[in-house]
Amino acid sequence: AFGISGVQKYTRALHDSSITGISPITEYLASLSTYNDQSITFALEDESYEIYVEDLKKDEKKDKVLLSYYESQHPSNESGDGVDGKMLMVTLSPTKDFWLHANNKEHSVELHKCEKPLPDQAFFVLHNMHSNCVSFECKTDPGVFIGVKDNHLALIKVDSSENLCTENILFKLSET
């Protein structure tokens, strides 16, 4: 977890939010855990943040992430619909001015200090899976999801809709 007080003091005024010219429809703080109930934690190491997937000790506080939700249209020619389909997109920020960021070249998930407007790599399409789990698909690389690999977050290519429910790309959100 953060050695600094950043996350636990993160009941600050929500991000001022004119990201890509649109405002989030809602924002809230939640802890992020895997399908198998391991916690996603963030640590400051050598002046950069590392992301870990780990079991927390009994009374250890979970790190919180600010989730900002945006509506996005995908054009009817992409969705195959007669109408534009609305998708729910999310950005994830564990501490002020830092956002989860998809590095598609390295297949990695990183924390980057970003200026607004945020780059597309900071946006993920939210999918509800497995009733109360979610997954995060890269806006910049459809079919690629945030997943768990070797106790770290990584980008994982999902080849078919049957594999959308594989446990390593499923996450749980909790306000507690």
Epitope: D81, G85, K86, M87, L88, L126, N132, S161, C165
Partner: antibody
Framework: EVQLVESGGGLVQPGGSLRLSCAAS????????MSWVRQAPGKGLEWVAS????????YYADSVKGRFTMSRDNSKNTLYLQMNSLRAEDTAVYYC???????????????WGRGTLVTVSS | DIQMTQSPSSVSASVGDRVTITCRAS??????LAWYQQKPGKAPTLLIY???SLQTGVPSRFSGSGSGTDFTLTISSLQPEHFATYYC?????????FGGGTKVEIK
């Protein structure tokens, strides 16, 4: 324009079966989560079953689990609800409803069909 | 499952009145709450999603607020076409659950 049209309702005896259909136009059903919601005469809305746009499910309310089966035929852009072992308490108008968001149920249901009445009585 | 409790179950009001309907969730649902209007013999129609976002085509006389467990639907100036039953629905956790409904009647 999005349209959902249910059919297949009617009068059936207790223990009988019906298959409801929901034909969609203006959208590709497979891109969206879809649900069946029912409303007994003079009562409120009750969720019955769902299939997620992301491929999860189907999921069922406890009251219909083991008796109802939800499916969709992507080639026909049609949703189905096979209802077996029907009971008097299943009497209701059955609506199909579309998730507002492709892939997520967080936005509620933005399009509903007009409904089809199922009456279970001897 | 999350229980949704709506109040009042019915309200009598006159054209031009301000009407407020509340919805309480049995546990926190962040902001994922929807409001629907239903007229007799018709299907429900979505009014508000994400607690406060107005669905396209819905008049701005309707507004929603709240987060966590307590939510409100307000009709700022009741019009004749607004006499109907209103339902809240939580969309945060599966399965989706609805409030019992609030019937807005003519005084």
């Amino acid at each position: 324009e999005v349209q959902l049209v249910e059919s297949g309702g009617g009068l059936v005896q207790p223990g009988g079966s019906l298959r409801l259909s929901c034909a969609a136009s203006g959208i590709t059903l497979s891109s969206y989560g879809m649900s069946w919601v029912r409303q007994a005469p003079g009562k409120g809305l009750e969720w019955v079953a769902s299939i997620f746009g992301s491929g999860g499910g189907p999921y069922y309310a406890d009251s219909v689990k083991g008796r109802f089966t939800m499916s969709r035929d992507n080639s026909k852009n049609t949703l189905y609800l096979q209802m077996n072992s029907l009971r008097a308490e299943d009497t209701a108008v059955y609506y199909c409803a579309k998730d507002r968001y492709s892939g997520s149920y967080y936005g509620g249901f933005d399009y509903w069909g007009r409904g089809t009445l199922v009456t279970v009585s001897s | 499952d999350i229980q949704m409790t709506q109040s009042p179950s019915s309200v009598s009001a006159s054209v031009g009145d301000r009407v407020t309907i509340t919805c309480r969730a049995s546990q926190g649902i962040t902001s994922w709450l929807a409001w629907y209007q239903q007229k007799p013999g018709k299907a429900p129609t979505l009014l508000i999603y994400a607690a406060s976002s107005l669905q396209t085509g819905v008049p701005s006389r309707f507004s929603g607020s709240g987060s966590g467990t307590d939510f409100t639907l307000t009709i700022s100036s009741l019009q004749p076409e607004h006499f109907a039953t209103y339902y809240c629905q939580q969309a945060n956790s599966f399965p989706p659950t609805f409030g019992g409904g609030t019937k807005v009647e003519i005084k």
